[in-house]
Amino acid sequence: SITGISPITESLASLSTYNDQSITFALEDESYEIYVEDLKKDKKKDKVLLSYYESQHPSSESGDGVDGKMLMVTLSPTKDFWLQANNKEHSVELHKCEKPLPDQAFFVLHNRSFNCVSFECKTDPGVFIGVKDNHLALIKVDYSENLGSENILFKLSEILEHHHHHH
């Protein structure tokens, strides 16, 4: 369960892949599309509002009873829109929604390789946001593979602003 309904902190950042491609968001036919692309030098990176929430582990998972806590994150590139996992389609989509946000909008934050992050679906443990064919997709990660796969690694570049932006 998420501890409390308000985030413990928020930050504004641009999101890029392990290979330094930018994650961008474009409004097309009244819905948002998500792209993974090389940005032209003068093009500004898209910003994402990351809201961080604490969540208690189910004690059976963590082996440490009530002590175990996870850090969950929601990602919003523009007002009222959040990244969501579509587990049936193995896709990552932007949906307009109101709070309280659905579970599909929450991702467990992992630090994997040092100074890279990964986003694991709250609704589907072992499934991560990843890059596939220049798009974001849901990728199942085999824990025996040590979770090092570069296609699920992302870099966050903090932007010193505190208010939600509007596209």
Epitope: S62, L109, H110, R112, S113, N146, L160
Partner: antibody
Framework: EVQLVESGGGLVQPGGSLRLSCAAS????????MYWVRQGPGKGLEGVSG????????YYTDSVKGRFTISRDNSKNTLFLQMNSLRAEDTAVYFC???????????????WGQGTLVTVSS | DIQMTQSPSSVSVSVGDRVTITCRAS???SSWLAWYQLKPGKAPKL??????SLQSGVPSRFSGSGSGTDFTLTISGLQPEDFAVYYC?????????FGGGTKVEIK
């Protein structure tokens, strides 16, 4: 109850080796980011080496790279720091610490051991 | 590496006083800052994480604030057991660097 107990410290000559252990109980070691931190005599805290829970990725501060190796034995729920080619400036109390959150170091380190003293001197 | 500049390096205060310790990061670290208390011969104790979240079991006289690059630890109504050395640590990116420490001593 979460507990971390370090051992393996002692007096060693420059160029020598030591292996520090950190026995963890009350939680699953592999689920958390673990970190070795040291405090030299009359000095502040310095992060030495870390290991990521889920990926097992490792980190070393520049001054120990190539000399120290962090590892863990999941079956024994124990963290290790193998210290080779020790120098006088490695003299310190070494603490092991566990992250607040199970998959990230963003929240800092909630549980610490009492520390083990490493003295490098001839 | 991110440099953490902590001030003052020491402060002499009386029981009941309010103490403010500041920490400045050399680059933006969002709210990823922790504060620790260290007493001789004891394990460091986490007081505040994520800049302002009070660690469970820590008295409410301890509070943290700030984001970006500037952060503050405040002890309101210092108690005898609060005389110790306090460290900030940026937990945003490796290496996870500490400030130089602030010694809070009895006046």
């Amino acid at each position: 109850e979460v507990q971390l107990v370090e051992s393996g410290g002692g007096l060693v000559q420059p160029g020598g080796s030591l292996r520090l252990s950190c026995a963890a109980s009350g939680f699953t070691l592999r689920s958390y980011v673990m970190y070795w931190v040291r405090q030299g005599p009359g000095k502040g805290l310095e992060g030495v080496s870390g290991i990521s829970g889920s990926s097992g990725g490792t980190y070393y501060t520049d001054s120990v790279k190539g000399r120290f190796t962090i590892s863990r034995d999941n079956s024994k729920n124990t963290l290790f720091l193998q210290m080779n080619s020790l120098r006088a400036e490695d003299t310190a109390v070494y603490f092991c610490a566990r992250s607040v959150y199970s998959t990230t170091w963003y929240g800092g380190f909630q549980h610490w051991g009492q520390g083990t003293l490493v003295t490098v001197s001839s | 590496d991110i440099q953490m500049t902590q001030s003052p390096s020491s402060v002499s205060v009386s029981v009941g006083d309010r103490v403010t310790i500041t920490c400045r990061a050399s680059q933006v670290i969002s709210s990823w800052l922790a504060w620790y208390q260290l007493k001789p011969g004891k394990a460091p104790k986490l007081l505040i994480y994520a800049a302002s979240s009070l660690q469970s079991g820590v008295p409410s006289r301890f509070s943290g604030s700030g984001s970006g690059t500037d952060f503050t630890l405040t002890i309101s109504g210092l108690q005898p057991e609060d005389f110790a050395v306090y460290y900030c640590q940026q937990t945003n990116s490796f290496p996870l660097t500490f400030g130089g420490g602030t010694k809070v001593e009895i006046k």
